[in-house]
């Protein structure tokens, strides 16, 4: 049984950076409208993007079933290639790891191959990010 005196309490790292967002609708040639169902998330959504505060590797999970065939990309920085890029799909169930840094913003871009669809509906739309390097550099 371990006993700690006040002066012996180990340093407390901030909680692991993670977020689970949902999306039920995407806009053609724009992105998906993301909402965070929990107010307790350690990462935040701003301007339809997930804000990255901590450098490091992130586990990224993306799921959803779409009302139309579409091409979907997940970006993290203007002028850089996408984290994910899927062409002509009606569903996605992907998982991967990517290095992200402070000031990055994770956001969607969606295009359909029909001019008649402005809105795309999504069942089970979910994006999860989990930071894999707690204790690394963070800026808030």
């Amino acid at each position: 049984c371990l006993h700690f005196y006040a002066s012996q309490v180990p340093p407390q790292y901030p909680p692991i950076q993670s977020i689970r967002v949902q999306f039920t609708r995407c806009e053609n040639e724009k992105g998906c409208i993301i909402t965070s169902p929990s107010k307790d998330e350690t990462m935040k959504v701003q301007d339809n993007s997930i804000i990255i505060n901590c450098d490091g590797f992130y586990l990224i999970s993306l799921k959803g079933y779409f009302s139309e065939e579409l091409s979907l990309s997940l970006y993290y920085r203007k002028g850089r290639g996408p984290l994910f890029s899927l062409s002509k799909v009606t569903s996605v169930d992907s998982i991967g790891v990517a290095y992200l840094a402070f000031k990055d913003k994770v956001y969607f871009n969606v295009t359909t191959h029909s001019t008649s669809y402005k809105d795309i509906q999504v069942n089970g739309g979910e994006l999860i990010l989990i930071h894999q390097n707690p204790g690394g550099f963070c800026a808030y």
Partner: antibody, heavy 118, light 106 residues
Framework: EVQLVESGGDLVKPGGSLRLSCVAS????????MSWIRQAPGKGLQWVSQ????????NYADAMKGRFTISRDNAKNTLYLQMNSLRDEDTALYYC???????????WGQGTLVTVSS | SYVLTQLSSKNVTLKQPAHITCGGD??????VHWYQQKLGQAPVLIIY???SRPTGIPERFSGANSGNTATLTISGALAEDEADYYC?????????FGGGTHLTVL
């Protein structure tokens, strides 16, 4: 196993109101768009309305706009259709439907009958 | 609003192919779903996204979509295939069903 059970259908006079319910089980209700689809006796299928999994987005067929309101209670796994200013032509079997993909209705209830007559 | 046109009825000889069509302006650019409805029963999804078949639907059912016509094909119609068949698309914030085709198997 996915199950959709509708209720609330009744005989109502023109101009009257009715609220239909659909209790869902066997899938993650809050993840799915849900729709109401109706079928008049001896006629074809007619889509009525849909609502997104989070309840934020709704759409209606033109003939139902302003008279019908779709809603959901994800805590109760229940879909609703509030029908006001009912007309004779609203007489139909009302189905609740959903699917793995939005708008591809792989799961249907057995329907609840609404009869509008004086 | 978008209109889908189906023949109201069609006859097919037992074990012969049946082609049920669904017409719509530039329907080939849209995703088409097909349903089978037998008398007194709820509809059943038999084809989604033009040509995909849900689990449990026999291989004799297939779909195609191009130009202004979507087609549901039953490669060899059986007596149990006698039913109403509906096509459906999503267009401009609304789902639209065709009027339905009643298939009679002779």
């Amino acid at each position: 196993e996915v199950q959709l059970v509708e209720s609330g259908g009744d005989l109502v006079k023109p101009g009257g109101s009715l609220r239909l319910s659909c209790v869902a089980s066997g899938f993650t209700f809050s993840s799915n768009y849900m729709s109401w689809i109706r079928q008049a006796p001896g006629k074809g299928l007619q889509w009525v309305s849909q609502i997104s999994g989070d309840g934020i987005y709704t759409n209606y067929a033109d003939a139902m706009k302003g008279r019908f309101t779709i809603s959901r209670d994800n805590a109760k796994n229940t879909l609703y259709l509030q029908m006001n200013s009912l007309r004779d032509e609203d007489t139909a079997l009302y189905y609740c439907a959903t699917g793995i993909y939005p708008n591809a209705f792989g799961y249907w209830g057995q329907g609840t009958l609404v009869t509008v007559s004086s | 609003s978008y209109v889908l046109t189906q023949l109201s009825s069609k006859n097919v000889t037992l074990k012969q192919p049946a082609h049920i069509t669904c017409g719509g302006d530039n329907i080939g650019s849209k995703s088409v779903h097909w349903y089978q409805q037998k008398l007194g029963q709820a509809p059943v999804l038999i084809i989604y996204y033009d040509s995909s078949r849900p689990t449990g639907i026999p291989e004799r059912f297939s779909g195609a979509n191009s130009g202004n016509t979507a087609t549901l094909t039953i490669s060899g119609a059986l007596a149990e295939d006698e039913a109403d068949y509906y096509c459906q698309v999503w267009d401009s914030s609304a789902n639209v069903f065709g009027g339905g085709t009643h298939l009679t198997v002779l």
